[in-house]
């Protein structure tokens, strides 16, 4: 039985301030059942960046078509990047439950922000 893999192919991404950053994440299977969420940072103090069902994330959009069937691409795009957005972003798979239980995290993608070219 192959174990679910959460793949963040880029270890780091560098973006100019004001531009958009694309953070890539794919999974190897549609199961176990449960959502994907994105966080900045690790551990108990991590910041939720994107969760489709709950919250309002005006600067974050999924890269793939939200009506695409059997989607395994959970990449996101963050618009209007500022230096405050720098950090390591994790794509995390949860197992459905009450509450959902964290199952596996990607290796993380470090986002660095360059000064806007003059």
């Amino acid at each position: 039985e192959e174990e679910l893999q959460v793949i963040q192919p880029e270890k780091s991404v560098s973006v100019a301030a004001g531009d958009s950053a694309t953070l890539n994440c794919t999974v190897s299977s549609l199961i176990p059942v449960g959502p994907i969420q994105w966080f900045r940072g690790a551990g108990p103090g991590r910041e939720l960046i994107y969760n489709l069902k709950e919250g309002h994330f005006p600067r974050v959009t999924p890269v793939s078509d939200p009506t695409k069937r059997n989607n395994m691409d959970f990449s996101i795009r963050i618009s209007n990047i500022t230096p405050a957005d720098a950090g390591t972003y994790y794509c995390v798979k949860f197992r459905k439950g009450s509450p959902d239980v964290e199952l596996k995290s990607g290796a993380g993608t470090e986002l660095s922000v360059r000064a806007k070219p003059s």
Epitope: S29, I31, V33, N70
Partner: antibody
């Protein structure tokens, strides 16, 4: 072409057991969640159970009595039904789950169903 | 548990007519609604998912709309093969997945 073929239905006395099987073909069985949905005679559809990998989910009406399982090497889904009651009488459908976007599951392919009758 | 209420329970329609089915959820389900058609003696068939996306091979006379708690399935011009029972299903909050009670379409 996706195919789901159920078997194992029949007549059983109250308190008895049955094991339903669903043979799947035409898709990568091991990466999809699978479900059982039933329909009592002349009634609507009722979700029974879903299995992901080793994660399982049940309707309250069958929890503790029914067990869903799968054998990915055989592309087969199972439903072990114990302590059967008259109200479990229904056509049992095997269904392939489909996900959309980042969201939940619905059922994009269904088998033809197998009839389970619980009667003394 | 989210309750789905379909109305009307039965519709008597002539071929060629426009038909509208309603599905109301007891709480917000965003756009996480699917519609199925079931003909007598047959398994259900997926028509619409994500409230408005037609499944592969479904004729364009079938369309879905709505979000939140109120959803509609429309058949723009009913064909003889469209008679049967239509069910909505929510997959926003589960378990359990829940289905509406169905709307039966009969020949007038």
């Amino acid at each position: 072409e996706v195919q789901l073929v159920e078997s194992g239905g029949g007549v059983v006395q109250p308190g008895g057991s049955l094991r339903l099987s669903c043979a799947a073909s035409g898709f990568s069985f091991s990466i999809y969640a699978m479900s059982w949905v039933r329909q009592a005679p002349g009634k609507g559809l009722e979700w029974v159970s879903t299995i992901g990998a080793d994660d399982t989910y049940y309707a309250d009406s069958v929890k503790g009595r029914f067990t869903i399982s799968r054998d990915n090497s055989k592309n087969t889904l199972y439903l072990q039904m114990n302590s059967l009651r008259a109200e479990d009488t229904a056509v049992y459908y095997c269904a392939k789950d489909s996900t959309v976007g980042w969201s939940g599951d619905f059922f994009d392919y269904w088998g033809q169903g197998t009839l389970v009758t619980v009667s003394s | 548990e989210i309750v789905l209420t379909q109305s009307p329970a039965t519709l008597s329609v002539s071929p060629g007519e426009r038909v509208t089915f309603s599905c109301r959820a007891s709480q917000n389900v965003r756009s996480d609604i699917a519609w199925y058609q079931q003909k007598p003696g047959q398994a259900p068939r997926l028509l619409i998912y994500a409230a408005s996306s037609r499944d592969t091979g479904i004729p364009d006379r079938f369309s879905g709309s709505g979000s939140g708690t109120d959803f509609t399935l429309t058949i723009s011009s009913l064909q003889s093969e469209d008679f049967g029972v239509y069910y909505c299903q929510q997959y926003y909050d589960w378990p359990p997945f829940t289905f509406g009670g169905g709307t039966k379409v009969e020949i007038k």
